[in-house]
Each structure stands twice: as C-alpha cells, then as structure tokens.
Amino acid sequence: KSPIFGPQEVSSIEGDSVSITCYYPDTSVNRHTRKYWCRQGASGMCTTLISSNGYLSKEYSGRANLINFPENNTFVINIEQLTQDDTGSYKCGLGTSNRGLSFDVSLEVSQVPELPSDTHVYTKDIGRNVTIECPFKRENAPSKKSLCKKTNQSCELVIDSTEKVNPSYIGRAKLFMKGTDLTVFYVNISHLTHNDAGLYICQAGEGPSADKKNVDLQVLAPEPELLYKDLRSSVTFECDLGREVANEAKYLCRMNKETCDVIINTLGKRDPDFEGRILITPKDDNGRFSVLITGLRKEDAGHYQCGAHSSGLPQEGWPIQTWQLFVNEESTIPNRRSVVKGVTGGSVAIACPYNPKESSSLKYWCRWEGDGNGHCPVLVGTQAQVQEEYEGRLALFDQPGNGTYTVILNQLTTEDAGFYWCLTNGDSRWRTTIELQVAEATREPNLEVTPQNATAVLGETFTVSCHYPCKFYSQEKYWCKWSNKGCHILPSHDEGARQSSVSCDQSSQLVSMTLNPVSKEDEGWYWCGVKQGQTYGETTAIYIAVEERTRGSSHVNPTDANARAKVALEEEVVDSSISEKENKAIPNPGPFANEREIQNVGDQAQENRASGDAGSADGQSRSSSSK
C-alpha cells in the first residue's frame, strides 16, 4: 500500500482554483526527492503536468505551481482558472518516474449554475441555519409575506405570515420582522440538510404589484480535513461545532458505507475496539471538544465525523465536522509490546518511546479510566511527583537521548491491571498505550529481600540483602532509595563479578545494602533491582523504618539472626573500604547517573557507581554490595 496520501475527490467550478495537499512519510529521502502531479490517460500512462524539478506542462503554464513543505512532509499543487477540461483522474506522487509512490485524486470541475440575474446566493454548511432577507416596498407592508421553494412545475410553500408552515419545515422555519423596519422580512431556517438546497422565492403581496426575490440556497457537506498519522502513533480530532450546540451531547463516529458508527460519545458509549486508547474531552462553553485516540492501527484509517445531538448519535440537520484519517504503516514509532504481563507481588518495567528529537521534553505515565468521558490521570512524570496511592512502588527513569524512558511499578496487585498511556508534553503523536495484565503469582518472586520486616536503629549499622536467582547473574544489580521524585540509585560495590566463575550457587546470590550509621532520613522505601545497560528489569521494594534504640533490646530479627550475621561478616571488609571512600566528597552527577570504574583487587572486581542522592554526610556510609 502506498504511503502517499491526499484528497480522494476534489470538486470545484469553472473559473475557480483548487489547492491539493499530498502527504508523504517523514524521511530525508522523501523530503528531497522529486514530487509530481500527473494526469492519467485511458492507456494507463500518467502524463506529468508539473513537478518539483521545475517542469511545467503547456496546459498549466501561468496557472499552476507545486510547492514542497519538507517541514510538514507535504507538497501542495495549486491550480487556477479551472475549466471543465480539467475534470479527470490524477496522481500526486514521489519518485524519479511517475511509476513511483503515488495517490489517486479525482478532480471534477462543474459549470457555474445558471441562475436568474437578481438571485441572491446563500452558502451554508449542513446542520447550520440561514436567515434569508426579503425586501419589499412599503405599499406591500400589510400584505401576506411568504417563502416558497421551487420545484419542477411550481413553488411549494415553506412558510408564510399567516403561520402556515410546510410539514418538513415545522420547528425549523420562522418568518419575522426586525424592529420598526417595514421594508424587509426575514425567514430563518435551522438544521439545514441537503434536501433544503435549491431555489427559493420570497414574496410580499399578490399579483403584478407583488415584490419577489430569487434566492439560491447551497447546503454543503463539510470538506473532510486530511489527517496523516503513523501506525502506533496518536491522533486528536479537534471538533468545533459552535455555541448553539454547546449543551448537546457530543459524538465521534466512523463512516461505514451508508451509516456512521459511533466510536465514543459524551453519554458514555464507547466502541470496544477503542477500549483503553480513547478519550473525549469536552473543552468549553463554545461547543468545542476533542477526541484523542492512541495506539493507531491500520484498520483505524477511514472517514470520521464529529457532531452534537441530545441522543449522542448522528442526526440529519445537525452540525458536523469530518476528517479522512490515513494510517502510514512506514511508522517512525518503534513496535513495542502493547501488552505487558506481571504477577501479584511482582513488578513490571515498561519501556515508553518518545520522539528522540525531543529528549528534553517532560515524560508522563497515566492510567486510562473509562468511566464517563474517560480520563487518564497522570501517576508519575519527570517533574510530576508520584501520585500518593502509588507511594513506594512507582518510579519513572528517564534515559536522556535514547528515545525511551522506563516506568517501573512493583508490589503489583490485580487492581493494577488495565490500560496505561506513555506520553510527553511535546510531540503528541508519540502517545502510546500499554495494557497491563496481572495474574496471581504461582511461585516465589525472583527477587527477595531479607529481613522482610526491616527496622533499623538510629546510629547503628543496618544491612538488608536482596537474593536473586542465577538467571540474573550477569545483570547489573542495584539498590535505590525511593522518593516521590524518583528512585535514586545508591553507589554499589559488586563482589560477584568474578571473571573465572562458571558455576552459580543458587543459595548465595545476593546484593546487600548497608546504612552506616543509620539516620532518621534513611527511613523510607528502598528498591532492589536488576538492569542490563539502560534496560531495567525486575524490582522488589522494602520499607525500612528507623527507630531509636530502646534499652536492652536487640534490633536484629531473631529469625534472621544467622543469615544477617553471615551477610554482615561477609560484608565487613568491604564496608570498611566503602566508609573510607565515601568520606571523600562524591560529585553529584544527577539522579540517574551510572558512572562505573572497575578496580581489580586480587581476583575480585570492585565496581563503584556514584550517583545523585548518593553523597552522604561526613562519617556516614550508604552503600550496596553484591555477591
């Protein structure tokens, strides 16, 4: 399927001009390659009429141009002084020959309709209203006023001043006069439909002295706005229907042969195909609203219409706005898993794509809620603190420059299942939807922290250990301290990276974190996690409470005493070296810095990781080490 897109049908009248916009995928090659407009002949040949290389055919000389807009990935063909000879089939396309990527456009140029010379033309959109002005001489002031619509043989009454109204205009037509002006009457017709188009005559008086005026009412279907979007990206339908329908229910529907199937409306209706990826946002008192759809699929392409009516359904004679949506399958948005699976008590790390050209944009993660018009409250963001009910279990890790940020959610429950959106405050096309599925856990978690009831004593040394399985042996282990602004990685000293090791003892794989001495600020949530480069994996969380020493009490949990003692012994030597290092000022390279310097000490590689929030006060050590 060609990724070029434009208007399928263009119509105009003789003497007028048209402007045809064609869209192409956002690539450097496409921006610079030849653009053309050609006319299809009976033989199937397409004869170039104009191209971006400067070619202009004889029949277009002085009346057409082609302009490339590389910043929008569009080119525009402008043609003036149209004649009926311009009616035909055309292609707009890209490439060195006219057999390149293209889109078919049908152009129809019709004759200017012949109307009586004194005809007043009113041009209105479907669903709107028209007020026809009917002047008359003063002597016809007492006479009957009327408006009729011309049919083949006669003129059928619409409304008159004796309050006679044609059944098809009841509730829609009003005849009135303004103020004291006795030389003009007006007829207002509301909720215009295609059937209302035609010639009308307004009349005051009877016989040869009557005042008559010819009126031509043209009722137009709105020209569809073209929307060119990438697969997996998002689209916003901005609908502006006017103040007169501000209080009516709003809808967005998709054309399906003769009908328009409602996708979403403000009365709570929503097409199941759009579950988790659509929102309708009533904007204001002016009848404006918008519909956001994320995670575009190729089957989403088509003709869309928005409107307003108390039923929340399309209704003839009510204002509408239309779009033609094209979904380009040559997408710049990476193909990521749209479903992420987790288990209760476990964690998920969700990689969110963003436009790499906008690495400084603010990143957000929200949870889609389908009730009412739909909402997506932001749970966390680069500068948006974690929502309170997610305390200790949600963080956003921004990896500047690589087009991805990661959201980690742990301590999962079945309540967390649902749809989530990744988005930024920049390019809105890069909104993506993730469905999170949470199943009941059937086995022990991969990461386990001991002691599980962690209470540290002020001023003492406190160690917690995180046990991990052999499958995580080669991955980087880390501890981080959670706050509502992120999870700040602590400096780590990895004892486990022995070059010669070929076996893995399942029972002794652990990464420990030591607080020495414990201070009141150490209280809070800590995460133990694994990552491979910039790809985050599983995490587990623990809350460490800090309390003052009570006389005669031990802060070591008896059930964990042996394990704790063992860990403490194994870590003792490492800790003394850490304390020395950490008493020196550690530069603060930012919240997620990950600078590593490897020092070989015997057969042991000791890895240091300095990180923001890692610097500690004199005499204090905050570290994690792994075996």
Partner: nanobody, 131 residues
C-alpha cells in the same frame, strides 16, 4: 489550597526587560494551569498569558504576543513571565493566578484567558515602565 507569591516587579525603562516569578506553595503545583493578569490604574484587570499544567501549551493576549514569554518549572513550583521590549502601557500591577485542572491527559493543553476560571490569586507585583 495554594498560596501564590509574585516577585520581580520594579521600575524599568521603555525597551527594557523584567522577569516576574510566581512561587506556589503546596505539593500539587502540577495540577494547576497558571496565568498572569494585570491591572493598570483605573482599568479592569486583563489577561496577559497562560500556561497549561505540563507547560506544553501557552496563550497570550494580542498586546503582548512576541514580547512576553510564560514558562513554568514544576520541580520548583514556580511560573515565570519574561517581559521584553517593555512599553509604558505595560505599567500595571501583575497578578499570578492558578486554575485547578487536575493532572490529566484531558487537561494537558488547557489554558484559559478568563478571569472567572481561576481559583487562586496572588497579591500582585508592581511593574512600572518609564518613557
């Protein structure tokens, strides 16, 4: 409840620049759309500029377009108004205002120039532009 405190006003010559700041108290700063309004002596309070809760959308009064820039730093709970090419007619008390919109995708681009839509107001800071 949010408290708003404006600063940065003062006396400046025509053609000069000033940067106003509005510091907000409270943890939920990023659930407010913010705006700047001004009131010249003997005149009604008028809209100057507004910014959505994400900072992704802004709006300006025609009289200041191209000269004033509104921005925000959610990490610092602060909204700014950079005023360049100042004119004597910019002389007024400048007020910072906050509209509760909630941190939601549906309000990401919401900005308002209507005084009645704002829920909280600062005390104002005087800007005087001399010719």
């Amino acid at each position: 409840e949010v408290q708003l405190v404006e600063s940065g006003g003062g006396l400046v010559q025509a053609g000069g620049s000033l940067r106003l700041s509005c510091a907000a108290s409270g943890r939920t700063f990023d659930s407010y759309a913010m705006g700047w309004f001004r009131q010249a002596p003997g005149k009604e309070r008028e809209f100057v500029a507004a910014i959505s809760w994400t900072g992704g959308s802004t709006d300006y009064a025609d009289s200041v377009k191209g000269r004033f820039t509104i921005s925000r730093d959610n990490a610092k709970n602060t909204v700014y108004l950079q005023m360049d090419s100042l004119k004597p007619e910019d002389t007024a008390v400048y007020y910072c205002a906050a509209e509760v919109v909630g941190r939601d995708v549906t309000t990401m681009y919401r900005v308002s120039g209507l005084e009645y839509e704002y829920d909280y107001w600062g005390q104002g800071t005087q800007v005087t532009v001399s010719s």
